[in-house]
């Protein structure tokens, strides 16, 4: 919907040692660099799929909304968004599918208005601990962040480091304290097997939490209990089978949540009591009704709300003398 | 930063239906929870009720329940709180408020019920 | 529903004095408290919310303290923009309630 002002870099690209001093002065009012769309009526910038393989140096200092998407930006280096004079006023920044596959320490420095980032479907094999924080103390300077949507970044199989995806994610996240300010967090699509148990305690503002899409086969270690204002968690298309009673307490003792839960191959057997007596009584899972069995086999595609305790039992377990080969 | 716009004073019946409107901006930080919160003349404030805009989810006080409905339009940020069989001690102003603290708040609708 | 009994009603203070208000609710709200603060003809604002927690934008000289079913709310140094009514509500059991409110003035 912006249309564009200037669509022509102020500099030739016949001189670079040009483009690259843009930053250290005003941007001229009109500038909107090369490949972009600009409207100073609506403080936005859209680069967006021209192949871009850095931050265009001459952004104009007006900008609010500031799309990059669709690029081959690859990496994105420290004071990646630095200029003199600062862009002092850029809220919402939208990276999605560039490409990225490394975000270094203090990519986001500089940028004291930043609310919303979005960097979502770049396949991030090296997110520096650093990325948010900007800083490696251990009490960084609070982050203006308020939205952090981060779906689908984890990178192919054969391209991640020798480490664990979640642990790459949660160290930038909880880096410095620097997010304690944060809403909203979507982390949906990652191949997310478990959540580390520290992430949620170091997060007390958050509203939003989204980890759809994931693998998560228990929240056992997890606690909800910091999270006294969260809104929604939406857990859909995971691999969960049973919400144990600590799980389910907990989750009853948040006055705003919303909780989503379609599509997990829920277990119905003995384990599942607990879980079937709250979601009769409970208020807090949306679409309660849809949620059915996926195992064991005679249960499957049975409503969970429509169980009553004689359907939920355990095979009993044979003593190793009476089990046969 | 949330600003909610409410729809203008009324002046009704008893008996007649009234439905006050409220529309937020700055929408993306906003919370999905809208509350409704009335304030007769010089008492204080009555909580009644709130709608989760995301999926229509509803929680009423029992005091006003079968009278209010609570309604939202994700399209246009819009809720709304529909109040019926109207009484003259329904007089008050009508204030939404969002967020699970009732963080920011329209600036009210006054409602006055009078034959 | 809870009931919330704040007191005092009204109470009067000199500009730079400290003002306490309590409130105490019927059962355990969990730390479920909020402050609001109301001007005459305008609508209320949330000073405070978790019981002790700053609203974004609001002035450090507010403060909340409280567990259980005691709460307090503390202007550290009045302000003659601080003269309002000042209500504080629970948010942990529906439906949400709020105290009688208290009306703070100038000496």
């Known amino acids: 919907s912006s249309s564009p002002t200037s669509s022509a870099s102020s500099f030739s690209s016949s001189a670079p040692f040009l483009a690259s001093a843009v930053s250290a002065q005003p941007p001229l009012p009109d500038q909107c660099p090369a490949l972009c769309e600009c409207s100073e009526a609506a403080r936005t910038v859209k680069c967006v799929n021209r192949n871009l393989t850095e931050v265009p140096t001459d952004l104009p200092a007006y900008v609010r909304n500031l799309f990059l998407t669709g690029n081959q930006l690859a990496v994105l280096p420290a004071g990646a968004f630095a200029r003199r004079p600062p862009l002092a006023e850029l809220a919402a920044l939208n990276l999605s599918g560039s490409r990225l596959d490394e975000v270094r320490a203090g990519a986001f420095e500089h940028l004291p208005s930043l609310r919303q980032l979005d960097l979502s479907h770049n396949p991030l094999a090296d997110l520096s601990p650093f990325a948010f924080s900007g800083s490696n103390a251990s009490v960084s300077a609070p982050s203006p962040l308020v939205e952090l949507i981060l779906n689908h970044i984890v990178p192919p199989e054969d391209e991640r480091q020798n480490r664990s995806f979640e642990g790459m994610v949660v160290a930038a996240l909880l880096a410095g304290r620097a997010l304690q300010g944060l809403r909203r967090l979507e982390l949906a699509s990652n191949h997310f097997l478990y959540l580390p148990r520290d992430v949620l305690a170091q997060l007390p503002s958050l509203r939003h939490l989204d980890l759809s899409n994931n693998s998560l086969v228990s929240l056992t270690y997890v606690s909800f209990r910091n999270l006294t204002h969260l809104e929604s968690l939406h857990l859909e298309d995971n691999a969960l089978k049973v919400l144990h009673n600590g799980t389910l307490a907990e989750l009853q003792g948040l006055p705003h949540i919303r909780v989503f839960l379609d599509n997990n191959p829920w277990v119905c057997d003995c384990h599942m009591a607990d879980m079937v007596t709250w979601l009769k009584e409970t208020e807090v899972v949306q679409g309660k009704d849809r949620l059915t069995c996926a195992y064991p086999e005679k249960m499957r595609n049975r409503v969970l709300l429509e169980l009553n305790s004689a359907d939920l039992d355990c095979d009993p377990i044979l003593p190793p003398s009476l089990q046969t080969s | 930063q949330v600003q909610l716009v409410q729809s203008g004073a009324e002046v009704k019946k008893p008996g007649a239906s009234v439905k006050v409107s409220c529309k937020a901006s700055?929408?993306?930080?906003?919370?999905?929870?809208m509350n409704w919160v009335r304030q007769a003349p010089g008492q204080g404030l009555e909580w009644m009720g709130r709608?989760?805009?995301?999926?229509?989810?509803?929680n009423y006080n029992g005091k006003f329940k079968g009278r209010v409905t609570m309604t939202a339009d994700k399209s246009i940020t819009t809720a709304y709180m529909e109040l019926s069989r109207l009484r003259s001690d329904d007089t008050a102003v009508y204030y939404c408020?969002?967020?699970?603290?009732?963080?920011?708040w329209g600036q009210g609708t006054l409602v006055t019920v009078s034959s | 529903d809870i009931q919330m009994t704040q007191s005092p009603s009204s109470l009067s203070a000199s500009v730079g004095d400290r003002v306490t208000i309590t409130c105490r609710a019927s059962q355990d709200i969990s730390n479920y408290l909020n402050w609001y603060q109301q001007k005459p003809g305008k609508a209320p604002k949330l000073l405070i919310y978790y019981t002790s927690r700053l609203h974004s934008g609001v002035p450090s000289r507010f403060s909340g303290s409280g567990s259980g079913t005691d709460y307090t709310f503390t202007i550290s140094s009045l302000q003659p923009e601080d003269i309002a009514t000042y209500f504080c509500?629970?948010?942990?059991?529906?439906?949400?309630?709020f105290g009688g409110g208290t009306k703070v003035e100038i000496k």
């Open positions: 700055g929408y993306a930080f906003s919370s999905s929870w």
């Open positions: 509500g629970n948010d942990n059991t529906l439906p949400w309630t």
């Open positions: 709608i989760y805009r995301e999926d229509g989810h509803t």
């Open positions: 408020a969002n967020g699970g603290a009732m963080d920011y």
